[in-house]
């Protein structure tokens, strides 16, 4: 009785269960009652990452430097090449097909998380007591200067974009 379903890592063809090709290999010829499935390794620039019956291997991804991409991990016969972005850039999508410059945090905002090759800068508003007066992809919000520790007094209050201005204490007259 010919099978209607096959075991894991097998496929049904012409009422027969044939072994799938292992990752890194493509199908050349289906099995017969007498012969095992014929598989061939993918060439150097190709890969297949699953047990398969593909007759063609997939081309490795090309990390195009014109799009700001560079190789993070070279592909093998079983894995695709992983691209990342050059310094100062990050991927526009999970598949990392192109790159854009990291965004800078505007004055009044500081860097919560520095950008990587795959994620953009994360900014946060400077809370009370902190400020940022620059547009930067690296700078965190800085604390206002503590006038008291310098034996000074606050002459001008700080904001989320400016530091406090300290000045000397007024001397009491005798």
């Amino acid at each position: 009785e010919p099978p209607t379903a096959c075991r894991e890592k097998q496929y049904l063809i012409n009422s027969q269960c044939c072994s799938l090709c292992q990752p890194g290999q493509k199908l050349v010829s289906d099995c017969t009652e007498f012969t095992e499935t014929e598989c061939l390794p993918c060439s150097e620039s190709e890969f297949l990452d699953t047990w398969n019956r593909e007759t063609r291997c997939h081309q490795h991804k090309y990390c195009d430097p014109n799009l700001g991409l560079q190789v993070q991990q070279k592909g093998t016969s079983e894995t695709d090449t992983i691209c990342t972005c050059e310094e100062g850039l990050h991927c526009t999508s999970e598949s990392c097909e192109s790159c854009v410059p990291h965004r800078s945090c505007l004055p009044g905002f500081g860097v919560k998380q520095i950008a990587t090759g795959v994620s953009d800068t994360i900014c946060e508003p400077c809370p009370v007591g902190f400020f940022s007066n620059v547009s930067s992809a690296f700078e965190k919000c800085r604390p206002w200067t503590s006038c008291e520790t310098k034996d000074l007094v606050v002459q001008q209050a700080g904001t989320n974009k400016t530091d406090v201005v300290c000045g000397p204490q007024d001397r009491q007259r005798a």
Epitope: T32, E33, F34, T35, E36, E38
Partner: antibody, heavy 117, light 109 residues
Framework: QVQLVESGGGVVQPGRSLRLSCAAS????????MHWVRQAPGKGLEWVAV????????YYADSVKGRFTISRDNSKNTLYLQMNSLRAEDTAVYYC??????????WGQGTMVTVSS | EIVLTQSPGTLSLSPGERATLSCRAS???????LAWYQQKPGQAPRLLIY???SRATGIPDRFSGSGSGTDFTLTISRLEPEDFAVYYC??????????FGGGTKVEIK
Amino acid sequence: QVQLVESGGGVVQPGRSLRLSCAASGFTFSSYGMHWVRQAPGKGLEWVAVISYEGSNKYYADSVKGRFTISRDNSKNTLYLQMNSLRAEDTAVYYCARDTSRGHDIWGQGTMVTVSS
Amino acid sequence: EIVLTQSPGTLSLSPGERATLSCRASQSVSSSYLAWYQQKPGQAPRLLIYGASSRATGIPDRFSGSGSGTDFTLTISRLEPEDFAVYYCQQYADYPPFTFGGGTKVEIK
């Protein structure tokens, strides 16, 4: 390169025996089924026998059933055809050929068997 | 047993002409398992076409196969001097036996 080379042919008297060999090289012999096909002088191709890659499945043409035995030794990359009770009509060139789902893709050069008194 | 009948027995043509060879089966054959072979004098057969219409590795594109069910055709679009030979069809769908047709000889006119 992928190659099949037959040997063991010759002239033999009717009723006698002969063993043909087919030496394989250039491919994983133990993964392929193998066939014997023959061709009488001036005639067409006639399929004789097949054996599966591990030797468990064997089929024969009615004309040789009970007289011929196909076997293989995967450790020696060699296919055999034991021919007993030979008849004049067994006179032919005997070819071994590799089995695939695409047909017989590799053939040997053949070995001549002549059954004559 | 599936009987394959090839016609014509002999085809006399000149180089450059088109050759059409027929193979008829006594019952329906899965086209996945119909092959054509070429054999020259003193040589072993060579696989030309498998699965009724797919060319084997290294076979020039002047050779083509077609057909389904019980009627199959091998066409050589423009005969080259090296194409004059005997051609056999074979079915390997229904076995035993694996059957060959009687052959068609393509000879120079």
